[in-house]
Interface confidence: medium
């Protein structure tokens, strides 16, 4: 498998509609929570919880508060912690408990607490509960956490240092933990947890599952250095905990390997970055996928695996288990065990099978299954991800986040569109098209290059939005920005489900908005911009420039993998002859205007998609270069001329190829402002032409024309 | 039953000024916000104010906030509103009214008919 | 500032009737946050739809609400006389604290 193309198109952060929401003095926006019902996005942040209208972020609902008091800063700072920034409250779990209030726990400046917030009145009701075990002491160290039926279940460290890794359930009936033993969690780096609920039709009575995610020191590698694994596991929701071994700890803790590599290279993933669990009407298991990074990666990997659930089950439930052995010099080595398992099989959920041996709790559970179960923890299966290869690899860049959407195109194909963020603030929008990755886009959502921190996807039908949150706040993207293409070959071109073409508009519209049949749209996954109908309507640039001058004549192609070049007199230009220059790759330049450069020049674009190329006219000017004499400015009136030579532009719409719309006039070279008379300039005798000053270029004005001071070049 | 009691009139000399009370039954009041709105035939329902009744924290609108004081009791399980230097403008109907969730008023007191006059 | 317009301000129908009332925003909000209410002569006001949409206990299913952005209506579908009251649309709360009711529309039988 290839790395991935660049993205197609990429769109800056002002280009693009996108909401922003950020409160002056509050950072680390990072941890979001959706009320779909509700149309409302939880936002906790360092010391502040918002409450923000989910289709409008920048509209704020509601805020509170939850700061820590000067005693507890200046504790915290006598360990040896920041007041600035450490000893604060950073909220890491932002849960819902009930309809009216979330579970909120913050790291408290190293005291970690956990509160319950009212979502009637927004107020925090006071609980202050310890946040041990739930919530880390540390703002930089890992945790993940889930509500499951008003229990929270959470990975993260359970000391000041952090020293201590924890998997626990807090329960007031039964809290459970994992042990503390490097064979359980060894130094684990938490990433992302979520229950999957067995379906109601199950036959073996089985259990809801909790799954946590996260990368740790191997145990069963032995390398120089230490080696990273990314790593499933999983307790039962019905989990008890052992009546004398394993009491109060889990007796259904299992993990396994998660394998993301590229096998023909050798390349292997094994920093896990984030999970995603996509579940889907047409999904009979979720789908999880999860990015990942190489341990050394100096040169900027990512990559994308997708796994069945099933897959991971069946490791899980018939999986062989690893075994510890000690060799020369007590050193231990970590092997498969081949030997006899006891039943109950250890780890597992009680089903029916077990109920009807009698097995009705883990309480019941015989000591042999416990005591292999505590001694057996990992699994020597390992969890391979759909196809056996990673869904998408990227070089150059670092993926933080990754979330994912599944959609059906007009053709009825589905497909599952990943968006994943990067640590430079931008948003890739990625699909496999027949075993080949297409990133459709990429869009700057942060300003200032900052990594992404969370993301977040709506599903609600209709409004469909990707929220992300960084350090400096949150922004709101919609899952297509198909209104900015402007022809049906940039909307055919673009390869995105959620967009197809409306040719009664004349517009590239979003699919799951509109309420109108799709019959009549145009969408072609494979990038057969041949099913665009013929243009009847293109339009033209008409340029007049002064004799000995530069031109600059634009062509606004968005396409990454297209490539540019330029026709004059349907002949095609070599950029590299001393008359003609390239600017910004695509814009053409014409040194030392003479009369013999008048004529027509066409921008065509070239795109290979699949075994097609496909040509675009993307823009075509008309240019006519003419000795102009100098007019004459009254003296009372002064005109600041600068360098470049173009004195008119006219805009005219005609019969042609190409279907940009109009743009407005354009420099001709970039190197200063004009200023202008508040009024025409008078001319000086009737032989010299009228020459009318607009302010504001105007599309269709008959004359929109410029002073300019003649190129000395 | 959840409900909301208020007096049913107040007869006051301008200038002077009017405590109307608001007693829950059936509740607490702690954990709702307590709002009060008032109605005269135009410009017909206006929002005065509302207060969190376990910690009194307030909120008023900028039209009211020299003209109401909201307190509570929650001994009492009463919420009060303070309208000072009364003039004929004040004369209307007052009504408390417990916040549900998003801002909607899912309980309403009886409302206490306010005249000013001398 | 904002502003909720109720239209039409008055409203006279047969029993059997179906009725429309609209409420427009002066600016976007969110459906969350657009109630309405039911007074009848003499009585406090009464939550019938809460969240644009959804009916308040009690409420009979012919109430129902819709929309969003600016626009938002309150329908019944069959009008029946005991439905003769002032309606009026809510916005609640956001930040700055500030909750508008419209100007309300007096539904009365022909």
């Known amino acids: 498998m290839a790395f991935a193309p660049i993205p197609r198109i990429t769109w800056e952060h002002r280009e693009v509609h996108l909401v922003q929401f950020h409160e002056p003095d509050i950072y680390n926006y990072s941890a979001l929570l959706l009320s779909e019902d509700k149309d409302t996005l939880y936002i906790g942040a360092r010391e502040a919880v918002f409450a923000v209208n989910a289709l409008n972020i920048s509209e704020k609902q509601h805020e509170v508060y939850w700061k820590v008091s000067e005693d507890k800063k200046a504790k915290c700072a006598e360990k040896g912690k920041s007041k600035q920034t450490e000893c604060l409250n950073y909220i890491r779990v932002l849960q819902p408990l009930s309809a009216t209030s979330l579970y909120v726990c913050g790291t408290n400046a190293f005291q970690p607490a956990c509160d319950h917030l009212n979502l009637t009145s927004f107020k925090f009701l006071g609980k202050n509960e310890d946040g041990k075990g739930r919530c880390p002491f540390d703002p930089a160290h890992s945790y993940t956490s889930v509500m499951v039926d008003g229990e929270l279940y959470s990975g993260t460290s359970y000391n000041f240092l952090g020293s201590e890794p924890i998997i626990s359930r807090n329960s007031s009936h039964s809290p459970l933990r994992t042990e503390y033993a490097i064979p359980w969690l060894n130094e684990p780096s938490f990433v992302f947890a979520d229950v999957i609920r067995k379906s109601p039709d199950s036959p073996d009575g089985e259990d809801d599952r909790v799954y946590f995610f996260f990368t740790e020191v191997s145990v069963e590698y032995e390398f120089v250095f230490r080696v990273l694994i990314p790593r499933i596991a999983r307790v039962c929701k019905g989990d008890q905990g052992g009546l004398r071994t394993l009491q109060k700890k889990w007796t259904s803790f299992l993990k396994a390997r998660l394998i993301c590599s590229r096998p023909d290279s050798g390349l292997v993933f094994n920093v896990l970055r984030d999970v995603f669990v996509l579940r889907s009407p047409g999904l009979k298991v979720p789908v999880f996928y999860a990015l990942f990074t190489p341990q050394l990666n100096n040169v900027g990997l990512s990559a994308v695996c997708a796994y069945n659930l099933s897959t991971a089950e069946e490791v899980f439930s018939h999986g062989k288990y690893m075994q510890s052995t000690t060799v020369e010099q007590s050193h231990t080595k970590w092997v498969r065990y081949n030997g006899p398992v006891p039943k109950p099989r250890p780890g597992a959920c009680i089903d029916s099978e077990a109920r009807a041996a009698n097995y009705t709790s883990s309480l019941n559970l015989p000591d042999k299954t416990l005591q292999f179960v505590k001694d057996h923890p990992l699994m020597d299966d390992s969890v391979t991800p759909i196809d056996n290869r990673p869904r998408l690899i990227k070089k150059d860049v670092n993926y933080t986040q990754i979330v994912v959407d599944r959609t059906q195109a007009l053709d009825g194909t589905v497909y599952d569109v990943m968006f994943v963020s990067t640590d430079r603030g931008a948003l890739h929008k990625a699909i496999s098209l027949e075993h080949a990755v297409h990133i459709i886009e990429e869009t700057q959502l942060f300003q200032d290059f900052e990594p992404v921190q969370t993301l977040l996807l709506s599903s609600k039908k209709g409004n469909r939005f990707v929220y992300a949150g960084s350090n400096s706040g949150v922004v709101q993207a919609p899952l297509a920005f198909c209104g900015k293409h402007g022809t049906c070959e940039d909307c055919v071109l673009a390869r995105d489900p959620y967009c197809a073409w409306s040719p009664p508009t004349a517009t590239c519209v979003a699919l799951h908005q509109t309420e109108s049949p799709s019959r009549g749209l145009i969408q072609e996954m494979s990038g057969d911009a041949s099913v665009c109908p013929d243009k009847s309507k293109g339009s033209y640039r008409q340029h007049f420039f002064k004799h000995g001058g530069t031109a600059e004549l634009k062509c606004s192609q968005k396409s990454n993998l297209a490539r540019v070049f330029w026709k004059f007199q349907n002949g095609v230009l070599k950029a590299e002859s001393p008359k003609y220059g390239l600017m910004g790759r695509k814009n053409l330049l014409i040194f030392n205007l003479s009369e013999g450069d008048s004529g027509v020049y066409q921008c065509l674009s070239e795109e290979r998609v699949k075994n097609k190329t496909v040509f675009q006219v993307v823009a075509k000017h008309v240019l006519e270069v003419k000795v102009v004499p100098k007019p004459v400015v009254a003296p009372t009136l002064s005109v600041v001329q600068t360098e470049g030579s173009r004195i008119a532009t006219k805009v005219l719409v005609a019969s042609t190829q190409g279907s940009s719309p109009p743009t407005p006039a354009v420099q001709a070279t970039s190197s200063g402002a004009i200023t202008l008379p508040p009024k025409p300039a008078p001319t000086g005798t009737s032989c010299e032409p009228k020459i009318v000053i607009n302010t504001v270029p105007q599309l269709h004005s008959e004359k929109t024309m410029y002073l300019k001071s003649s190129d000395n070049r | 039953q959840v409900q909301l009691q208020q007096p049913g009139a107040e007869l006051v000399r301008p200038g002077s000024s009017v405590k109307l009370s608001c007693k829950a039954s059936g509740h607490t009041l702690t954990g709702f916000w307590m709002h009060w709105v008032r109605q005269r035939p135009i410009p017909g329902l206006e929002w005065i104010g509302n207060?969190?009744?376990?910690?009194?924290?307030?909120h008023y609108n900028q039209k009211f906030e020299d003209k109401a004081t909201l307190t509570v009791d929650k001994s009492s399980n009463t919420a009060y509103m303070l309208l000072s230097s009364l003039t004929s403008e004040d004369s209307a109907v007052y009504y408390c009214?417990?916040?549900?969730?998003?801002?909607?008023?899912?309980?309403w007191g009886t409302g206490t008919t306010v005249t000013v006059s001398s | 500032e904002f502003v909720l317009t109720q239209s039409p301000t008055t409203l006279a129908a047969s029993p059997g009737e179906k009725i429309t009332i609209t409420c427009s925003a002066s600016?976007?909000?969110?459906?969350?946050?657009l109630h309405w209410y039911q007074q009848k002569p003499g009585f406090s006001p009464k939550l019938l739809i809460y969240?644009?949409?959804n009916l308040a206990s009690g409420v009979p299913a012919r109430f129902s609400g819709s929309g969003s952005g600016t626009s938002y209506s309150l329908t019944i579908g069959t009008m029946e006389a005991e439905d003769v009251a002032t309606y009026y649309c809510q916005k609640g709360s956001s930040i700055p604290r500030m909750y508008t009711f419209g100007g309300g529309t007096k539904l009365e039988i022909k």
């Open positions: 969240r644009t949409s």
């Open positions: 009214a417990r916040e549900g969730g998003t801002g909607y008023f899912d309980v």
């Open positions: 600016s976007s909000i969110s459906s969350n946050y």
């Open positions: 207060i969190d009744p376990s910690d009194s924290e307030t």
